[in-house]
């Protein structure tokens, strides 16, 4: 189970993980105390048949070719959490592990 | 965390889970002893902004709008295994739980 890593200079057209730093302050998300920014990454690229398919199911749906099923798309296949300190809606400061904030791997599903 | 369920008569255009029975015999996958067919389901539909987004990350990437990032796509967000009996490449009969064969929920990611 692997995925491609690319950067802004890459010529790769296939599904790939690209670096992206999310800046909460720039978004005006002022309820987030920390981190103010973090490396989130994102997925982009084409999903040719079978390339980086995460699930056997993806292949089976392609074979069955039901009405309206699009081809697989380039999407996160492995994600990880980050620890965040933030204000909730009750003015309380909350510390918690927020799941699925970082893309570790991209694939076609 | 929920997802829409549709069928072939639905007029829903948004990301939805549709029924799909996979027939291994029809595919010519004769190394599979059992099941010969099973309910796999599949995902199809449009991902309007924020609708059924599985991860906060999806929203953040939309905000950051990096080069080449497509919008979220309708993809499995919860899957389950099935038990299968099959021949492996060494002519042995194997019984095992095969992960991610059934789509339980669809979402935008």
């Amino acid at each position: 189970d692997f995925g491609l890593d690319c950067d802004e200079h890459s010529t790769e057209s296939r599904c790939c993980r690209y670096p992206l730093t999310v800046d909460f302050e720039a978004f005006g998300w002022d309820w987030i105390i920390a981190p103010k920014r973090y490396k989130a990454n994102y997925c982009s690229g084409e999903c040719e048949f079978v390339f980086l398919q995460k699930y056997p199911h993806t292949h089976l749906v392609h074979q069955a070719n039901p009405r309206g099923s699009a081809g697989p798309c380039c999407t996160p296949t492995k994600m990880s959490p980050i620890n965040m300190l933030y204000f909730n809606g009750k003015e309380q400061i909350i510390y918690g592990k927020i799941p699925a904030m970082v893309v570790d791997r991209c694939g076609c599903s | 965390d929920f997802g829409l369920d549709c069928d072939e008569h639905s007029t829903e255009s948004r990301c939805c889970r549709y029924p799909l029975t996979v027939d291994f015999e029809a595919f010519g996958w004769d190394w599979i002893i059992a099941p010969k067919r099973y309910k796999a389901n599949y995902c199809s539909g449009e991902c309007e902004f924020v609708f059924l987004q599985k991860y906060p990350h999806t929203h953040l990437v939309h905000q950051a709008n990096p080069r080449g990032s497509a919008g979220p796509c309708c993809t499995p967000t919860k899957m389950s295994p099935i038990n299968m009996l099959y021949f492996n490449g060494k002519e042995q009969i194997i019984y095992g739980k095969i992960p991610a064969m059934v789509v339980d929920r669809c979402g935008c990611s």
């Epitope: 002022d30 309820w31 105390i33 920390a34 103010k36 620890n83 300190l85 204000f87 003015e91 400061i93 510390y95 | -």
Partner: antibody, heavy 113, light 108 residues
């Protein structure tokens, strides 16, 4: 960019009064509790007072309770600290803060005869 | 009311050396709400580490935090000239904030 700018500091005699202001920008001011923190010359940081987002509840350290009053005007994005019965030991740089992350640069209050 | 005691009061070290700063709470506190700041003369305090061990974005990774219960530590693995400052631990409970007395890290 979040900015907290304190004003109103200065020299005052013991027993006198002073009102500090803190103008907030770049922050949804009305959504958050705000605090005053001070630092006396050569001493450490001391939390002084806090106020809820609506201004409905206020909190004070024992050293200032009964003498200082914290308030806010959300329409003006401004936090206040009314200081009465000032003592020499109240001499400090007073910081306005949305703890723990956003702080102003501070305003100096000197209590001396 | 929680009291935070920092030690030593002053730490005299040379650039390149390791600094270990202690913060002890009078009773057990939540590690989620124990933070560290750096303060320099004429500047507002700056949040360095949040929730005991998480580095704030932009803070060099030579800074690290650890601890639980009543004992917490800030470590600077190799002191740089810009690291000489006063460091404070701070605890949050409800709307009350408690600061430690500070540790001054000075050039030897």
């Amino acid at each position: 960019e979040v900015q907290l700018v304190e004003s109103g500091g200065g020299l005052v005699q013991p027993g006198g009064s002073l009102r500090l202001s803190c103008a907030a920008s770049g922050l949804t001011f009305s959504r958050y509790p705000m605090s005053w923190v001070r630092q006396a010359p050569g001493k450490g940081l001391e939390w002084v007072s806090a106020i809820t987002s609506s201004g409905g509840s206020t909190y004070y350290s024992d050293t200032v309770k009964g003498r200082f009053t914290i308030s806010r005007d959300n329409a003006k994005n401004t936090l206040y600290l009314q200081m009465n019965s000032l003592r020499a030991e109240d001499t400090a740089v007073y910081y306005c803060a949305r703890l723990p992350d956003y702080w102003g640069q501070g305003t100096l209050v000197t209590v001396s005869s | 009311e929680i009291v935070l005691t920092q030690s030593p009061g002053t730490l005299s070290l040379s650039p390149g050396e390791r600094a270990t700063l202690s913060c002890r709470a009078s009773s057990s506190v939540s590690s989620s709400y124990l933070h560290w700041y750096a303060a320099k003369p004429g500047q507002a305090p700056r949040l360095l580490i949040y929730s005991t061990s998480n580095l704030v974005a932009g803070i060099p990774d030579r800074f690290s935090g650890s601890g639980s219960g009543t004992d917490f530590t800030l470590t600077i693995s190799r002191l740089e000239p810009e690291d000489f400052a006063v460091y404070y631990c701070q605890h949050y409970s409800g709307y009350h904030f408690t600061f430690g007395g500070g540790t001054k890290v000075e050039i030897k």
